[in-house]
Protein backbone atom coordinates (compact mmCIF):
# COMPACT_ATOMS: atom_id res chain seq x y z
CA UNK A 1 0.00 0.00 0.00
CA UNK A 2 2.64 2.50 1.04
CA UNK A 3 4.79 1.72 -1.98
CA UNK A 4 1.85 2.26 -4.29
CA UNK A 5 1.12 5.60 -2.64
CA UNK A 6 4.76 6.58 -2.91
CA UNK A 7 4.77 5.62 -6.56
CA UNK A 8 1.60 7.66 -7.23
CA UNK A 9 2.94 10.66 -5.33
CA UNK A 10 6.26 10.49 -7.16
CA UNK A 11 4.38 10.44 -10.47
CA UNK A 12 2.03 13.29 -9.54
CA UNK A 13 4.60 15.72 -8.18
CA UNK A 14 6.74 15.69 -11.34
CA UNK A 15 6.64 19.06 -13.08
CA UNK A 16 5.36 18.01 -16.48
CA UNK A 17 2.13 18.31 -18.43
CA UNK A 18 -0.64 16.16 -17.01
CA UNK A 19 0.35 16.02 -13.32
CA UNK A 20 -1.52 17.59 -10.40
CA UNK A 21 1.67 19.41 -9.42
CA UNK A 22 2.21 20.91 -12.88
CA UNK A 23 -1.31 22.34 -13.17
CA UNK A 24 -1.04 24.14 -9.83
CA UNK A 25 2.57 25.08 -10.45
CA UNK A 26 1.96 26.89 -13.75
CA UNK A 27 -0.82 28.99 -12.24
CA UNK A 28 -1.36 28.86 -8.50
CA UNK A 29 -4.88 27.89 -7.50
CA UNK A 30 -4.41 29.72 -4.23
CA UNK A 31 -5.34 33.37 -3.89
CA UNK A 32 -2.23 35.22 -2.79
CA UNK A 33 -2.46 38.62 -1.12
CA UNK A 34 0.25 41.07 -0.26
CA UNK A 35 -0.61 43.42 2.59
CA UNK A 36 1.45 46.55 3.15
CA UNK A 37 1.87 48.61 6.30
CA UNK A 38 3.54 51.96 5.69
CA UNK A 39 5.63 53.62 8.40
CA UNK A 40 4.33 57.19 8.53
CA UNK A 41 6.98 59.50 10.02
CA UNK A 42 5.50 61.74 12.71
CA UNK A 43 8.41 64.12 13.38
CA UNK A 44 10.28 64.82 10.12
CA UNK A 45 11.50 68.30 11.10
CA UNK A 46 12.89 67.23 14.48
CA UNK A 47 14.81 64.40 12.85
CA UNK A 48 16.26 66.62 10.14
CA UNK A 49 17.14 69.52 12.45
CA UNK A 50 18.12 67.74 15.68
CA UNK A 51 18.87 64.16 14.67
CA UNK A 52 16.06 63.01 16.98
CA UNK A 53 14.76 59.47 17.07
CA UNK A 54 12.40 58.85 14.17
CA UNK A 55 8.83 58.43 15.42
CA UNK A 56 6.87 56.12 13.15
CA UNK A 57 3.26 55.03 13.11
CA UNK A 58 2.34 52.08 10.93
CA UNK A 59 -0.70 52.50 8.68
CA UNK A 60 -2.29 49.55 6.96
CA UNK A 61 -3.09 47.04 5.74
CA UNK A 62 -3.22 48.12 2.12
CA UNK A 63 -3.88 44.91 0.26
CA UNK A 64 -3.04 43.78 -3.26
CA UNK A 65 -3.80 40.55 -5.03
CA UNK A 66 -0.54 39.13 -6.40
CA UNK A 67 0.78 35.99 -8.13
CA UNK A 68 -2.40 35.58 -10.15
CA UNK A 69 -0.56 35.36 -13.47
CA UNK A 70 0.50 32.06 -14.97
CA UNK A 71 4.18 31.31 -15.44
CA UNK A 72 5.42 32.31 -18.89
CA UNK A 73 7.81 30.77 -21.42
CA UNK A 74 7.50 27.38 -19.73
CA UNK A 75 10.06 25.22 -21.52
CA UNK A 76 10.94 21.62 -20.73
CA UNK A 77 14.49 20.41 -21.32
CA UNK A 78 14.39 16.63 -21.66
CA UNK A 79 18.16 16.42 -21.73
CA UNK A 80 18.82 17.72 -18.23
CA UNK A 81 15.30 17.13 -16.84
CA UNK A 82 14.63 20.77 -16.09
CA UNK A 83 11.84 23.19 -16.82
CA UNK A 84 12.48 26.91 -17.25
CA UNK A 85 10.02 29.77 -16.83
CA UNK A 86 9.44 33.41 -16.05
CA UNK A 87 7.26 34.41 -13.11
CA UNK A 88 5.30 37.52 -14.22
CA UNK A 89 4.61 40.24 -11.68
CA UNK A 90 1.23 41.81 -11.22
CA UNK A 91 -0.60 43.56 -8.40
CA UNK A 92 -4.27 44.53 -8.16
CA UNK A 93 -5.40 46.79 -5.35
CA UNK A 94 -8.16 45.35 -3.14
CA UNK A 95 -10.06 48.27 -1.58
CA UNK A 96 -12.33 46.01 0.48
CA UNK A 97 -9.30 44.48 2.21
CA UNK A 98 -7.59 47.83 2.80
CA UNK A 99 -7.88 50.62 5.35
CA UNK A 100 -7.78 53.33 2.72
CA UNK A 101 -7.04 54.05 -0.93
CA UNK A 102 -3.92 54.13 -3.08
CA UNK A 103 -4.19 57.92 -2.91
CA UNK A 104 -3.55 58.02 0.85
CA UNK A 105 -0.58 60.23 1.77
CA UNK A 106 2.42 59.24 3.89
CA UNK A 107 5.44 61.09 5.21
CA UNK A 108 8.42 58.90 4.37
CA UNK A 109 12.14 59.21 3.85
CA UNK A 110 13.06 60.85 0.55
CA UNK A 111 14.24 57.76 -1.31
CA UNK A 112 16.20 59.65 -3.96
CA UNK A 113 18.01 61.91 -1.51
CA UNK A 114 18.99 58.99 0.75
CA UNK A 115 20.09 56.82 -2.17
CA UNK A 116 21.99 59.50 -4.10
CA UNK A 117 23.93 60.63 -1.04
CA UNK A 118 24.93 57.01 -0.42
CA UNK A 119 25.85 56.14 -4.01
CA UNK A 120 27.82 59.34 -4.63
CA UNK A 121 30.22 59.69 -1.72
CA UNK A 122 32.58 62.15 -3.40
CA UNK A 123 32.13 65.46 -1.59
CA UNK A 124 32.18 67.58 -4.73
CA UNK A 125 29.49 65.41 -6.30
CA UNK A 126 27.51 65.72 -3.07
CA UNK A 127 27.76 69.49 -3.41
CA UNK A 128 26.33 69.23 -6.91
CA UNK A 129 23.54 67.02 -5.55
CA UNK A 130 22.94 69.52 -2.76
CA UNK A 131 22.35 72.36 -5.20
CA UNK A 132 19.89 70.17 -7.15
CA UNK A 133 18.13 69.06 -3.95
CA UNK A 134 17.73 72.70 -2.93
CA UNK A 135 16.65 73.78 -6.41
CA UNK A 136 13.97 71.07 -6.52
CA UNK A 137 12.80 72.00 -2.99
CA UNK A 138 13.41 68.41 -1.90
CA UNK A 139 14.15 67.49 1.69
CA UNK A 140 15.13 64.54 3.88
CA UNK A 141 11.49 63.48 4.07
CA UNK A 142 8.72 63.71 1.52
CA UNK A 143 4.97 63.22 1.31
CA UNK A 144 3.94 60.54 -1.18
CA UNK A 145 0.79 58.60 -1.97
CA UNK A 146 0.75 54.85 -1.50
CA UNK A 147 0.64 54.36 -5.26
CA UNK A 148 3.68 56.58 -5.76
CA UNK A 149 5.67 55.02 -2.96
CA UNK A 150 5.11 51.44 -4.12
CA UNK A 151 4.89 51.67 -7.88
CA UNK A 152 6.86 54.78 -8.75
CA UNK A 153 6.85 58.55 -9.21
CA UNK A 154 8.96 61.06 -11.09
CA UNK A 155 11.40 62.49 -8.59
CA UNK A 156 11.85 66.29 -8.85
CA UNK A 157 15.47 66.22 -7.67
CA UNK A 158 16.57 63.43 -10.00
CA UNK A 159 14.78 65.18 -12.86
CA UNK A 160 17.30 68.03 -12.53
CA UNK A 161 20.38 65.78 -12.80
CA UNK A 162 21.98 66.90 -16.07
CA UNK A 163 23.14 63.45 -17.15
CA UNK A 164 21.17 60.25 -17.80
CA UNK A 165 19.73 58.76 -14.61
CA UNK A 166 16.46 56.94 -13.93
CA UNK A 167 14.19 59.71 -12.71
CA UNK A 168 11.36 57.39 -11.65
CA UNK A 169 11.62 56.11 -8.10
CA UNK A 170 9.46 53.59 -6.23
CA UNK A 171 10.09 50.77 -3.79
CA UNK A 172 8.76 48.19 -6.25
CA UNK A 173 9.32 50.11 -9.47
CA UNK A 174 9.11 48.65 -12.06
CA UNK A 175 6.62 45.92 -11.12
CA UNK A 176 3.53 45.46 -13.31
CA UNK A 177 4.43 44.10 -16.75
CA UNK A 178 7.76 42.76 -15.49
CA UNK A 179 8.79 39.20 -14.68
CA UNK A 180 11.13 37.49 -12.25
CA UNK A 181 13.57 34.99 -13.71
CA UNK A 182 14.40 33.13 -15.88
CA UNK A 183 14.22 30.28 -13.37
CA UNK A 184 15.35 26.82 -14.43
CA UNK A 185 14.23 24.12 -11.99
CA UNK A 186 14.49 20.36 -11.92
CA UNK A 187 11.26 18.71 -13.04
CA UNK A 188 11.92 15.55 -10.97
CA UNK A 189 11.52 13.14 -13.87
CA UNK A 190 14.82 11.41 -13.29
CA UNK A 191 15.12 12.09 -9.56
CA UNK A 192 12.04 13.06 -7.56
CA UNK A 193 14.18 14.25 -4.64
CA UNK A 194 15.29 17.17 -6.83
CA UNK A 195 11.85 18.28 -8.00
CA UNK A 196 11.34 22.08 -7.96
CA UNK A 197 14.92 22.66 -6.83
CA UNK A 198 16.40 25.61 -8.70
CA UNK A 199 19.19 24.71 -11.09
CA UNK A 200 19.86 28.25 -12.35
CA UNK A 201 18.43 31.74 -11.87
CA UNK A 202 18.94 34.27 -14.66
CA UNK A 203 21.21 31.72 -16.28
CA UNK A 204 23.55 31.38 -13.32
CA UNK A 205 24.04 29.09 -10.32
CA UNK A 206 25.28 32.00 -8.22
CA UNK A 207 23.94 35.47 -7.52
CA UNK A 208 27.15 37.57 -7.65
CA UNK A 209 25.92 39.61 -4.68
CA UNK A 210 27.68 37.79 -1.86
CA UNK A 211 30.93 36.05 -1.08
CA UNK A 212 31.38 32.29 -0.65
CA UNK A 213 28.39 30.04 0.18
CA UNK A 214 26.12 33.04 0.81
CA UNK A 215 26.03 33.59 -2.94
CA UNK A 216 24.57 30.17 -3.73
CA UNK A 217 21.06 29.64 -5.07
CA UNK A 218 19.79 26.88 -2.79
CA UNK A 219 16.61 24.84 -2.78
CA UNK A 220 13.26 25.71 -4.34
CA UNK A 221 11.26 28.94 -4.56
CA UNK A 222 9.32 27.80 -1.42
CA UNK A 223 6.07 27.13 -3.32
CA UNK A 224 6.84 23.43 -3.03
CA UNK A 225 9.59 21.10 -1.90
CA UNK A 226 10.56 17.57 -2.90
CA UNK A 227 8.03 15.06 -1.48
CA UNK A 228 8.22 13.10 1.77
CA UNK A 229 9.35 16.00 3.92
CA UNK A 230 10.80 15.03 7.30
CA UNK A 231 10.54 17.13 10.44
CA UNK A 232 14.29 16.94 10.86
CA UNK A 233 14.94 18.55 7.49
CA UNK A 234 16.23 22.06 6.99
CA UNK A 235 14.28 23.40 4.03
CA UNK A 236 16.36 25.63 1.81
CA UNK A 237 14.75 28.10 -0.55
CA UNK A 238 15.67 31.12 -2.64
CA UNK A 239 13.81 34.43 -2.46
CA UNK A 240 14.55 37.00 -5.13
CA UNK A 241 12.83 39.64 -2.95
CA UNK A 242 15.66 39.43 -0.44
CA UNK A 243 18.37 38.56 -2.98
CA UNK A 244 19.48 35.47 -1.11
CA UNK A 245 18.79 31.85 -0.22
CA UNK A 246 17.49 31.19 3.26
CA UNK A 247 16.12 28.24 5.23
CA UNK A 248 13.24 27.13 7.42
CA UNK A 249 13.13 24.61 10.27
CA UNK A 250 10.25 22.56 11.65
CA UNK A 251 8.28 24.20 14.42
CA UNK A 252 5.00 22.35 14.94
CA UNK A 253 2.26 20.10 13.56
CA UNK A 254 -0.71 22.10 12.29
CA UNK A 255 -4.11 20.99 11.06
CA UNK A 256 -5.04 23.01 7.99
CA UNK A 257 -8.63 22.44 6.87
CA UNK A 258 -8.38 18.83 7.94
CA UNK A 259 -4.99 18.32 6.32
CA UNK A 260 -2.03 17.54 8.60
CA UNK A 261 0.79 19.94 7.70
CA UNK A 262 4.22 20.73 9.09
CA UNK A 263 4.81 24.35 10.05
CA UNK A 264 8.32 25.40 9.11
CA UNK A 265 9.57 28.78 10.30
CA UNK A 266 12.54 31.03 9.56
CA UNK A 267 14.55 30.80 12.76
CA UNK A 268 16.14 33.78 14.46
CA UNK A 269 19.50 32.08 13.82
CA UNK A 270 19.08 32.82 10.11
CA UNK A 271 19.22 36.54 10.96
CA UNK A 272 21.97 36.32 13.57
CA UNK A 273 25.32 38.05 13.37
CA UNK A 274 28.41 36.02 12.44
CA UNK A 275 29.36 36.21 16.12
CA UNK A 276 26.40 33.97 16.95
CA UNK A 277 26.09 32.16 13.62
CA UNK A 278 29.47 31.93 11.85
CA UNK A 279 27.76 30.76 8.64
CA UNK A 280 26.40 34.30 8.24
CA UNK A 281 29.84 35.92 7.91
CA UNK A 282 29.41 36.38 4.19
CA UNK A 283 26.15 38.29 4.60
CA UNK A 284 28.09 40.99 6.43
CA UNK A 285 29.31 43.18 3.57
CA UNK A 286 30.67 46.23 5.37
CA UNK A 287 32.08 47.03 8.79
CA UNK A 288 30.73 50.47 9.75
CA UNK A 289 26.93 50.15 9.70
CA UNK A 290 27.19 46.57 10.96
CA UNK A 291 29.44 47.68 13.83
CA UNK A 292 32.14 45.25 12.78
CA UNK A 293 29.58 42.56 11.92
CA UNK A 294 28.10 42.51 15.42
CA UNK A 295 24.72 44.01 14.43
CA UNK A 296 22.08 41.52 13.36
CA UNK A 297 18.62 41.25 11.90
CA UNK A 298 19.19 43.52 8.91
CA UNK A 299 20.52 42.50 5.51
CA UNK A 300 22.30 45.00 3.28
CA UNK A 301 21.08 44.20 -0.25
CA UNK A 302 22.52 47.32 -1.89
CA UNK A 303 24.60 45.22 -4.29
CA UNK A 304 21.37 43.74 -5.60
CA UNK A 305 19.70 47.17 -5.86
CA UNK A 306 22.18 49.09 -8.05
CA UNK A 307 23.96 50.47 -5.00
CA UNK A 308 20.85 51.93 -3.38
CA UNK A 309 21.19 51.43 0.39
CA UNK A 310 18.28 49.03 0.84
CA UNK A 311 18.24 46.92 3.99
CA UNK A 312 15.85 44.01 4.45
CA UNK A 313 14.68 42.92 7.88
CA UNK A 314 11.74 41.25 9.51
CA UNK A 315 8.81 43.58 10.34
CA UNK A 316 9.36 45.94 13.25
CA UNK A 317 12.98 44.74 13.35
CA UNK A 318 11.99 41.38 14.82
CA UNK A 319 15.14 39.38 15.67
CA UNK A 320 17.29 42.50 15.11
CA UNK A 321 19.93 43.89 17.46
CA UNK A 322 18.95 46.78 19.77
CA UNK A 323 21.30 49.23 18.03
CA UNK A 324 19.26 48.86 14.82
CA UNK A 325 15.90 49.78 16.33
CA UNK A 326 17.24 52.22 18.95
CA UNK A 327 16.89 55.35 16.73
CA UNK A 328 13.31 54.41 15.77
CA UNK A 329 10.33 54.94 18.08
CA UNK A 330 6.99 53.22 17.57
CA UNK A 331 8.05 49.68 16.72
CA UNK A 332 6.52 46.64 18.45
CA UNK A 333 7.95 43.39 17.14
CA UNK A 334 6.19 40.13 17.93
CA UNK A 335 6.78 36.66 16.51
CA UNK A 336 3.16 35.77 15.82
CA UNK A 337 2.58 38.76 13.54
CA UNK A 338 6.03 39.34 12.12
CA UNK A 339 7.79 36.04 11.47
CA UNK A 340 7.66 34.03 8.25
CA UNK A 341 6.25 30.53 8.13
CA UNK A 342 5.45 27.83 5.57
CA UNK A 343 2.82 25.14 6.15
CA UNK A 344 3.94 22.15 4.14
CA UNK A 345 2.00 19.00 3.41
CA UNK A 346 4.78 16.49 4.03
CA UNK A 347 3.78 13.74 1.58
CA UNK A 348 3.64 15.93 -1.53
CA UNK A 349 5.96 18.69 -0.30
CA UNK A 350 3.40 21.29 -1.38
CA UNK A 351 3.21 24.55 0.57
CA UNK A 352 -0.50 24.78 1.34
CA UNK A 353 -0.33 27.92 3.45
CA UNK A 354 2.33 30.52 3.98
CA UNK A 355 2.98 33.96 5.42
CA UNK A 356 6.05 35.70 4.08
CA UNK A 357 6.84 38.81 6.08
CA UNK A 358 9.57 41.30 5.42
CA UNK A 359 10.39 44.94 5.95
CA UNK A 360 12.01 47.34 3.52
CA UNK A 361 14.38 49.86 5.10
CA UNK A 362 16.66 52.51 3.67
CA UNK A 363 19.91 53.69 5.15
CA UNK A 364 20.39 57.43 5.51
CA UNK A 365 23.69 58.87 6.66
CA UNK A 366 24.87 62.31 7.69
CA UNK A 367 26.42 64.30 4.86
CA UNK A 368 28.60 67.34 5.35
CA UNK A 369 27.79 68.69 1.92
CA UNK A 370 24.07 67.94 1.66
CA UNK A 371 22.20 70.56 3.62
CA UNK A 372 19.14 68.45 4.45
CA UNK A 373 21.38 65.70 5.92
CA UNK A 374 23.92 67.99 7.50
CA UNK A 375 22.46 68.04 11.00
CA UNK A 376 22.25 64.27 11.35
CA UNK A 377 24.56 62.98 14.05
CA UNK A 378 24.14 59.25 13.32
CA UNK A 379 23.19 56.70 10.70
CA UNK A 380 19.58 55.57 10.53
CA UNK A 381 18.21 52.40 9.00
CA UNK A 382 14.80 53.85 8.30
CA UNK A 383 11.78 51.51 8.04
CA UNK A 384 9.67 52.44 5.02
CA UNK A 385 7.12 49.62 5.00
CA UNK A 386 6.56 46.02 5.91
CA UNK A 387 4.61 43.44 3.98
CA UNK A 388 2.77 40.24 4.66
CA UNK A 389 2.32 38.00 1.63
CA UNK A 390 -0.10 35.19 2.39
CA UNK A 391 -1.75 32.31 0.63
CA UNK A 392 -3.98 29.51 1.90
CA UNK A 393 -5.30 26.52 0.00
CA UNK A 394 -8.97 27.05 -0.94
CA UNK A 395 -11.76 24.92 0.57
CA UNK A 396 -12.43 23.12 -2.70
CA UNK A 397 -8.76 22.31 -3.25
CA UNK A 398 -8.45 21.23 0.38
CA UNK A 399 -11.33 18.77 -0.06
CA UNK A 400 -9.70 17.40 -3.18
CA UNK A 401 -6.38 17.14 -1.36
CA UNK A 402 -7.96 15.33 1.59
CA UNK A 403 -9.72 12.82 -0.59
CA UNK A 404 -6.90 12.20 -3.03
CA UNK A 405 -3.81 12.43 -0.83
CA UNK A 406 -4.14 12.47 2.95
CA UNK A 407 -7.37 10.48 2.99
CA UNK A 408 -5.78 7.65 1.04
CA UNK A 409 -2.83 7.49 3.40
CA UNK A 410 -4.90 7.57 6.58
Amino acid sequence: GDLLIQKTIKKQVVLEEGTIAFKNWVKTGTEVYRQFWIFDVQNPQEVMMNSSNIQVKQRGPYTYRVRFLAKENVTQDAEDNTVSFLQPNGAIFEPSLSVGTEADNFTVLNLAVAAASHIYQNQFVQMILNSLINKSKSSMFQVRTLRELLWGYRDPFLSLVPYPVTTTVGLFYPYNNTADGVYKVFNGKDNISKVAIIDTYKGKRNLSYWESHCDMINGTDAASFPPFVEKSQVLQFFSSDICRSIYAVFESDVNLKGIPVYRFVLPSKAFASPVENPDNYCFCTEKIISKNCTSYGVLDISKCKEGRPVYISLPHFLYASPDVSEPIDGLNPNEEEHRTYLDIEPITGFTLQFAKRLQVNLLVKPSEKIQVLKNLKRNYIVPILWLNETGTIGDEKANMFRSQVTGKIN
Epitope: Y120, N122, F124, M127, I128, S131, P162, Y163, K369
Partner: antibody, heavy 115, light 107 residues
Framework: EVQLVQSGAEVKKPGSSVKVSCKAS????????MQWVRQAPGQGLEWMGG????????AYAQKFQGRVTLTADKSTSTAYMELSSLRSEDTAVYYC????????WGQGTLVTVSS | ETTVTQSPAFMSATTGDKVTISCITS??????MNWYQQKPGEPPKLLIS???TLRPGVPSRFSSSGYGTDFTFTINNIESEDAAYYYC?????????FGQGTKLEIK
Protein backbone atom coordinates in the same frame (compact mmCIF):
# COMPACT_ATOMS: atom_id res chain seq x y z
CA GLU B 1 54.37 62.22 -6.95
CA VAL B 2 51.15 64.04 -7.95
CA GLN B 3 51.60 66.27 -10.98
CA LEU B 4 49.24 68.35 -13.08
CA VAL B 5 50.78 69.51 -16.35
CA GLN B 6 48.90 72.06 -18.41
CA SER B 7 49.10 72.95 -22.10
CA GLY B 8 51.05 75.99 -23.25
CA ALA B 9 50.14 79.66 -23.52
CA GLU B 10 47.58 80.74 -26.14
CA VAL B 11 46.83 83.99 -27.94
CA LYS B 12 43.23 84.18 -29.18
CA LYS B 13 41.02 86.57 -31.08
CA PRO B 14 37.83 87.91 -29.47
CA GLY B 15 34.83 85.69 -30.25
CA SER B 16 36.96 82.56 -30.67
CA SER B 17 37.39 79.60 -28.28
CA VAL B 18 40.29 78.18 -26.33
CA LYS B 19 40.76 74.67 -24.99
CA VAL B 20 43.24 74.14 -22.18
CA SER B 21 44.35 70.64 -21.21
CA CYS B 22 45.57 69.34 -17.86
CA LYS B 23 47.31 65.97 -17.72
CA ALA B 24 47.34 64.29 -14.32
CA SER B 25 49.82 61.73 -13.04
CA UNK B 26 50.88 60.18 -9.73
CA UNK B 27 47.37 59.19 -8.64
CA UNK B 28 44.24 57.45 -9.97
CA UNK B 29 42.65 60.15 -12.13
CA UNK B 30 39.03 59.16 -11.52
CA UNK B 31 39.43 59.21 -7.72
CA UNK B 32 39.34 63.01 -7.49
CA UNK B 33 37.51 65.82 -9.18
CA MET B 34 39.34 68.47 -11.18
CA GLN B 35 38.58 72.11 -10.54
CA TRP B 36 39.40 75.10 -12.74
CA VAL B 37 40.37 78.52 -11.40
CA ARG B 38 41.40 81.62 -13.27
CA GLN B 39 43.38 84.71 -12.31
CA ALA B 40 43.30 87.89 -14.35
CA PRO B 41 46.50 89.98 -14.34
CA GLY B 42 46.94 91.59 -10.91
CA GLN B 43 43.62 90.19 -9.72
CA GLY B 44 42.43 87.56 -7.27
CA LEU B 45 41.40 83.96 -7.81
CA GLU B 46 38.07 83.00 -9.37
CA TRP B 47 36.52 79.51 -9.40
CA MET B 48 35.12 78.55 -12.80
CA GLY B 49 33.85 75.03 -12.28
CA GLY B 50 34.73 71.43 -11.56
CA UNK B 51 34.28 67.96 -12.98
CA UNK B 52 34.25 64.54 -11.35
CA UNK B 53 35.74 62.10 -13.89
CA UNK B 54 34.17 59.08 -12.18
CA UNK B 55 30.51 60.12 -12.42
CA UNK B 56 30.72 62.86 -15.03
CA UNK B 57 29.26 65.27 -12.45
CA UNK B 58 29.95 68.89 -13.40
CA ALA B 59 29.33 72.23 -11.72
CA TYR B 60 29.96 75.65 -13.22
CA ALA B 61 30.06 79.11 -11.66
CA GLN B 62 26.99 81.07 -12.83
CA LYS B 63 29.24 83.65 -14.48
CA PHE B 64 30.65 81.08 -16.91
CA GLN B 65 27.51 78.97 -17.47
CA GLY B 66 26.96 78.47 -21.19
CA ARG B 67 30.47 79.60 -22.13
CA VAL B 68 32.64 77.04 -20.41
CA THR B 69 32.72 73.28 -21.05
CA LEU B 70 34.60 70.91 -18.80
CA THR B 71 35.44 67.39 -19.94
CA ALA B 72 37.62 64.57 -18.68
CA ASP B 73 39.22 61.70 -20.55
CA LYS B 74 39.84 58.82 -18.15
CA SER B 75 41.86 56.87 -20.73
CA THR B 76 44.52 59.58 -20.88
CA SER B 77 44.01 61.02 -17.37
CA THR B 78 43.45 64.42 -18.91
CA ALA B 79 40.95 67.14 -18.04
CA TYR B 80 39.96 69.88 -20.45
CA MET B 81 38.50 73.34 -20.06
CA GLU B 82 37.04 75.03 -23.13
CA LEU B 83 35.99 78.67 -22.99
CA SER B 84 34.05 80.10 -25.92
CA SER B 85 33.02 83.58 -27.10
CA LEU B 86 36.26 84.99 -25.75
CA ARG B 87 36.53 88.66 -24.86
CA SER B 88 39.46 90.76 -23.75
CA GLU B 89 38.47 90.42 -20.07
CA ASP B 90 39.05 86.66 -20.35
CA THR B 91 42.78 87.34 -20.54
CA ALA B 92 44.06 85.44 -17.51
CA VAL B 93 46.11 82.55 -16.20
CA TYR B 94 43.93 79.44 -16.10
CA TYR B 95 44.74 76.77 -13.51
CA CYS B 96 43.56 73.22 -13.08
CA UNK B 97 43.61 72.11 -9.47
CA UNK B 98 42.71 68.84 -7.78
CA UNK B 99 39.97 68.10 -5.26
CA UNK B 100 37.68 70.32 -3.25
CA UNK B 101 40.52 71.79 -1.22
CA UNK B 102 42.68 72.49 -4.32
CA UNK B 103 45.58 70.49 -2.91
CA UNK B 104 47.66 70.30 -6.11
CA TRP B 105 47.78 72.85 -8.92
CA GLY B 106 48.91 72.89 -12.52
CA GLN B 107 51.57 75.42 -13.50
CA GLY B 108 48.93 77.62 -15.17
CA THR B 109 48.16 78.47 -18.79
CA LEU B 110 48.19 82.10 -19.89
CA VAL B 111 45.41 82.86 -22.34
CA THR B 112 45.66 86.27 -24.00
CA VAL B 113 42.61 87.57 -25.86
CA SER B 114 43.55 90.34 -28.23
CA SER B 115 42.52 91.58 -31.64
CA GLU C 1 25.96 82.07 -3.05
CA THR C 2 28.29 82.43 -0.08
CA THR C 3 30.33 85.61 -0.29
CA VAL C 4 33.69 85.71 1.47
CA THR C 5 35.00 89.02 2.81
CA GLN C 6 38.74 88.97 3.44
CA SER C 7 40.63 91.64 5.31
CA PRO C 8 42.94 93.43 5.29
CA ALA C 9 43.74 93.73 1.59
CA PHE C 10 47.31 94.70 2.42
CA MET C 11 49.54 94.39 5.44
CA SER C 12 53.15 95.01 6.30
CA ALA C 13 55.10 93.16 8.97
CA THR C 14 58.59 92.69 10.29
CA THR C 15 60.29 89.31 10.62
CA GLY C 16 59.41 87.76 13.95
CA ASP C 17 56.00 89.46 14.03
CA LYS C 18 52.65 87.76 14.29
CA VAL C 19 49.96 88.59 11.73
CA THR C 20 46.31 87.60 11.39
CA ILE C 21 44.03 87.65 8.37
CA SER C 22 40.26 87.48 8.70
CA CYS C 23 37.66 85.92 6.41
CA ILE C 24 33.97 86.35 7.11
CA THR C 25 31.36 84.38 5.18
CA SER C 26 27.77 85.39 4.44
CA UNK C 27 26.46 81.92 5.39
CA UNK C 28 27.38 79.30 7.97
CA UNK C 29 30.01 77.05 6.39
CA UNK C 30 30.90 74.90 9.44
CA UNK C 31 34.72 74.59 9.32
CA UNK C 32 35.01 74.33 5.53
CA MET C 33 37.61 77.06 5.05
CA ASN C 34 40.93 76.64 3.26
CA TRP C 35 43.96 78.94 3.13
CA TYR C 36 46.46 79.45 0.31
CA GLN C 37 49.74 81.23 -0.28
CA GLN C 38 50.69 82.56 -3.71
CA LYS C 39 54.03 83.97 -4.72
CA PRO C 40 54.56 85.93 -7.96
CA GLY C 41 54.64 83.77 -11.09
CA GLU C 42 53.60 80.64 -9.18
CA PRO C 43 50.30 78.81 -8.68
CA PRO C 44 48.73 79.08 -5.23
CA LYS C 45 49.81 76.56 -2.59
CA LEU C 46 47.44 74.99 -0.08
CA LEU C 47 48.58 75.67 3.48
CA ILE C 48 45.55 74.75 5.59
CA SER C 49 42.52 72.73 4.53
CA UNK C 50 39.01 72.23 5.99
CA UNK C 51 38.91 71.81 9.73
CA UNK C 52 42.09 73.89 10.25
CA THR C 53 44.23 70.98 9.05
CA LEU C 54 47.83 71.96 8.41
CA ARG C 55 49.09 70.39 5.20
CA PRO C 56 52.14 68.09 5.37
CA GLY C 57 55.38 70.03 4.92
CA VAL C 58 53.81 73.36 5.89
CA PRO C 59 55.66 75.04 8.81
CA SER C 60 53.79 75.04 12.13
CA ARG C 61 53.98 78.83 12.38
CA PHE C 62 50.94 78.84 10.08
CA SER C 63 47.61 78.13 11.78
CA SER C 64 43.93 78.90 11.48
CA SER C 65 40.78 78.85 13.56
CA GLY C 66 37.11 79.54 13.21
CA TYR C 67 33.74 77.94 12.68
CA GLY C 68 30.47 79.05 11.14
CA THR C 69 31.07 82.47 9.62
CA ASP C 70 34.23 83.89 11.26
CA PHE C 71 37.67 82.58 10.36
CA THR C 72 41.19 83.67 11.22
CA PHE C 73 44.50 82.78 9.64
CA THR C 74 47.63 83.39 11.72
CA ILE C 75 51.34 83.47 10.95
CA ASN C 76 53.51 83.44 14.05
CA ASN C 77 57.13 84.47 14.02
CA ILE C 78 57.07 85.72 10.42
CA GLU C 79 60.00 84.97 8.13
CA SER C 80 61.02 86.87 5.02
CA GLU C 81 59.96 84.00 2.76
CA ASP C 82 56.37 84.51 3.93
CA ALA C 83 56.01 87.58 1.73
CA ALA C 84 53.17 86.60 -0.62
CA TYR C 85 49.47 86.90 -1.35
CA TYR C 86 47.16 84.89 0.93
CA TYR C 87 43.68 83.73 -0.04
CA CYS C 88 40.86 81.98 1.79
CA UNK C 89 38.39 79.70 0.02
CA UNK C 90 35.07 78.34 1.31
CA UNK C 91 34.43 74.76 0.19
CA UNK C 92 31.12 74.23 1.95
CA UNK C 93 28.78 74.90 -0.96
CA UNK C 94 28.62 75.78 -4.63
CA UNK C 95 29.81 78.01 -6.11
CA UNK C 96 33.17 77.78 -4.38
CA UNK C 97 34.20 81.31 -3.47
CA PHE C 98 37.52 82.97 -2.62
CA GLY C 99 38.29 85.93 -0.45
CA GLN C 100 39.72 88.94 -2.32
CA GLY C 101 43.23 88.21 -1.11
CA THR C 102 45.72 89.82 1.30
CA LYS C 103 49.11 91.05 0.20
CA LEU C 104 51.68 90.50 2.96
CA GLU C 105 54.84 92.60 2.68
CA ILE C 106 57.87 91.99 4.90
CA LYS C 107 59.73 95.13 5.85
Amino acid sequence: EVQLVQSGAEVKKPGSSVKVSCKASGYRFSDYEMQWVRQAPGQGLEWMGGIDPETGGIAYAQKFQGRVTLTADKSTSTAYMELSSLRSEDTAVYYCTRKLDFDYWGQGTLVTVSS
Amino acid sequence: ETTVTQSPAFMSATTGDKVTISCITSTDIDDDMNWYQQKPGEPPKLLISEGSTLRPGVPSRFSSSGYGTDFTFTINNIESEDAAYYYCLQSDNLPLTFGQGTKLEIK
